[in-house]
């Protein structure tokens, strides 16, 4: 059987290294050897590259080596396959070296911001050592912010090798780290070099981008002053690297700027003590380059009625997120402030907040919240400078069984009855929403009985007990993850009711 006709011939010129052709099929059933016939020097010269299937590796490949590779040139390539039964010739293929030249990657030697030019990085690189000196090179520059997985690309060409190999990348984010990599190819070639070593550069810092500002209104004190906890943070969209040197706050009662007070702080929170009137609060951040735009907040008067528009709210868990959704009766409200903090018996150590625009839902990654902790989540509608009534809910990102069961005691022990009371489990030990309590009780050497009651019940009267009998009892508190028993208590029913006993005594 004759060998298969060599097809899919593909050639590539590795500049100053070799000219390599490959073809299919890669493997023949019987012993086959190949000749690659080349004409070069624009058809004036010819030679042969030979291979056979005893050659190691992929034998459907052959390379011509210097010094007979000169550029520019046009080659013809024909592959002959031969076995014991005869020869099969491929079609003649034509190759322009400029069109199939592959060069090595360039080397970026500098990625720098240029003093005074904002949001730009200047990339300087070294042209590949193995690249034709006279050739115009085309380039692809890939770049991404350091925390992103997504590359952006820009294409350009460079002609003059005596000038700096430089490209100015504009319209970047301020004070942001970028990763860069570059590849190149001769302008006419279909083959790109590999990508260069990645380099990192940082755009120039600017005046701060802006602030998000919020407050917690606390109950008025005895002297009538209202503590207002102000808090602020870098606005969404601000550069990751941005750092403020400090913050200026000024505030005054509405319509009375003469009473303006100012505060300078390096913290991102500050407590003000305000009167009962409406106040306006302004905050700016600053660094060595200037100030951010002003963040403004209106603090309502003590007696001001706030609007209510959130009608319902649900919290649900997806595989890796907590999603809170709400319904509103006010279509004009499209900004909301979400607060969340752990529901603990003491003052919460962490208080978080975030603005939501043009949506009626809020999402947080589960791993940003602690499992087994209950979170209070409140959503405030914000309409221009007015803040409405919040709607609140609670959520766990992961429930567990309670760390402790209820502390239980037996009261009002009778002949056939007993009243059991138990305390709520402390918040820190619940590990989930308590959905019910189950009372397990058992007479000495008797059968165990149980009774399940709702989570809002903390007392239960057991009836139909046996007189003058010792019982053991415990209460189990259950979450969706399971239950935990409280301490076991023992009691003994009376042989005669106190009522009868006293009655008898009176006679």
């Amino acid at each position: 059987v004759l060998p298969a006709k060599p097809e899919n011939i593909s050639c590539i010129f590795y500049y100053e290294e070799n000219f390599t052709c490959t073809w299919s099929p890669e493997k023949e059933a019987s012993y086959t050897w190949y000749k690659v016939k080349r004409t070069y020097s624009y058809g004036y010269k010819s030679d042969i590259c030979s291979t056979d299937n005893s050659t190691r590796g992929n034998h459907a490949s052959c390379s011509f080596l210097p010094p007979t590779i000169t550029n520019p040139d046009n080659y013809t390539i024909q592959v002959e396959a031969q076995n014991a039964d005869g020869i099969m010739k491929s079609d003649i293929t034509y190759w322009n070296l400029d069109a199939i030249m592959k060069i090595e990657p360039p080397e970026i030697f500098s990625v720098k911001s240029v003093l005074g030019i904002k949001r730009m990085l200047q990339i300087k690189w070294i042209r590949p050592v193995l690249a034709p000196h006279s050739s115009t090179l085309k380039y692809t520059l890939r770049f991404r912010t350091i925390n992103s997985a997504y590359w952006m690309e820009v294409n350009f060409t460079k002609e003059d090798i005596d000038r700096d190999e430089t490209y100015n990348l504009t319209e970047l984010q301020a004070f942001t780290e970028y990763v860069m990599t570059l590849r190149c190819a001769p302008a006419e070639s279909m083959f790109w070099s590999g990508w260069s070593q990645e380099k990192v550069g940082t755009t120039e810092e600017e005046a701060p981008y802006g602030l998000d500002l919020w407050r917690v209104l606390k109950p008025a004190m005895v002297d009538g002053r209202r503590p207002v906890q102000l808090m602020w943070k870098k606005a969404t969209g601000a550069p990751v690297l941005e750092k403020a040197l400090g913050y200026n706050i000024w505030y005054f009662p509405e319509n009375n700027t003469n009473l303006t007070e100012t505060v300078n702080t390096t913290n991102q929170t500050h407590e003000l003590y305000l009167g009962g009137k409406t106040y306006w609060v302004y905050v700016v951040s600053y660094n060595s380059l200037g100030e951010s735009p002003v963040a403004t907040l209106r603090i309502p008067a003590l007696n001001e009625k706030t609007f209510q528009c959130i009608e319902a709210m649900q919290a649900c868990l997806t595989q890796d997120q907590l999603v809170v959704e709400w319904q509103s009766s006010a279509p004009e409200v499209d900004t909301w402030m979400v607060e969340w903090f752990p529901d603990v018996d003491s003052e919460p150590s962490s208080f978080s907040w975030e603005s939501v625009s043009q949506a009626r839902n809020w999402t947080i990654q589960k791993d940003e919240l602690k499992p087994l902790w209950c979170y209070n989540i409140s959503v405030y509608p914000v309409l221009r400078d007015r803040v409405g009534q919040p709607y609140s809910t609670q959520a766990y990102v992961q429930e567990g069984i309670p760390s402790a069961g209820p502390v239980t005691q037996a009261d009002s022990i009778g002949v056939k009855t007993v009243t059991i009371t138990w305390k709520e489990i402390p918040k820190s030990k619940r590990n989930g929403f308590i959905k019910n309590y189950t009372i397990f009780y058992q007479a000495e050497d008797g059968k165990e009985f149980s009774k399940t009651v709702n989570s809002n019940i903390l007392q239960y009267r057991l009836e139909s007990l046996t007189r003058r009998t010792s019982y053991s009892l415990q209460v189990m508190a259950s979450t969706n993850a399971g239950g935990t028993n409280g301490t076991k208590i023992n009691f003994k029913t009376l042989s005669i009711s106190h009522h009868h006993h006293h009655h008898h005594h009176h006679h």
């Epitope: 030697f109 720098k112 050592v129 700096d164 780290e177 990645e198 990192v200 940082t202």
Partner: antibody
Framework: EVQLVESGGGLVQPGRSLKLSCVAS????????MTWIRQAPGKGLEWVAS????????YYPDSVKGRFTISRDNAKSTLYLQMNSLRSEDTATYYC??????????????WGQGTLVTVSS | DIVMTQSPTSMSISVGDRVTMNCKAS??????VDWYQQKTGQSPKLLIY???NRYTGVPDRFTGSGSGTDFTFTISNMQAEDLAVYYC?????????FGGGTKLELK
């Protein structure tokens, strides 16, 4: 085999000039950027100057800018460092290095043996 | 310019020891750190580039690792001929800058 041989070092008074040379062999000189790096006695390494393969662009740190000039003669495969207005803090061994380069490896894979420049009155 | 801070500045070691030294960059340099060895009276030699590739002919007892701002160079089985000063260098951006060096001495 790549070889870099520096010469021209010696004792010179502050304010005077000196010219260092570096003859390269074993590679195609005009394909590569070249760099001078120095090392003060008992101290670390400090970049001094770089030049592109064509000689079209040069780079210097602030410490030598305006006083030192790097140049090359590709026909002679020779790199130069002209040092003017020398100061005592320029006292160092000056190394000629090939690079930075696009060839796989570090920026400075090849170094000469160094030539000592002593600036003293 | 990027500052490369090398630690420790010197170490007393014995033959056969595992030796680790560190280099901290003042800003992110990606993976663009090389390590050089300089023996007394000799010019520096490239050992490791970017930041874990062994240069041609360098024994495999020399290794490098790290990215961003923190880099480590290790000699797994110290030999007498490894007594030298070791320098890290960032090649992320011009100008290239070197660490102050770590000198290895015999105990």
């Amino acid at each position: 085999e790549v070889q870099l041989v520096e010469s021209g070092g010696g004792l010179v008074q502050p304010g005077r000039s000196l010219k260092l040379s570096c003859v390269a062999s074993g590679f195609t000189f005009n394909n590569y950027w070249m760099t001078w790096i120095r090392q003060a006695p008992g101290k670390g390494l400090e970049w001094v100057a770089s030049i592109t393969n064509t000689g079209g662009s040069t780079y210097y740190p602030d410490s030598v800018k305006g006083r030192f000039t790097i140049s090359r003669d590709n026909a002679k495969s020779t790199l130069y460092l002209q040092m003017n207005s020398l100061r005592s803090e320029d006292t160092a061994t000056y190394y000629c290095t090939r690079g930075p380069t696009t060839v796989v490896g570090g920026w400075f894979a090849y170094w000469g043996q160094g030539t000592l420049v002593t600036v003293s009155s | 310019d990027i500052v490369m801070t090398q630690s420790p500045t010197s170490m007393s070691i014995s033959v056969g020891d595992r030796v680790t030294m560190n280099c901290k960059a003042s800003q992110n340099v990606g993976s663009n750190v090389d390590w050089y060895q300089q023996k007394t009276g000799q010019s520096p030699k490239l050992l490791i580039y970017r930041p874990s590739n062994r240069y041609t002919g360098v024994p495999d007892r020399f290794t490098g690792s790290g990215s961003g701002t923190d880099f480590t160079f290790t000699i797994s089985n110290m030999q007498a001929e490894d007594l030298a000063v070791y320098y890290c260098m960032q090649s992320n951006s011009y100008p290239p800058t070197f660490g102050g060096g770590t000198k290895l001495e015999l105990k």
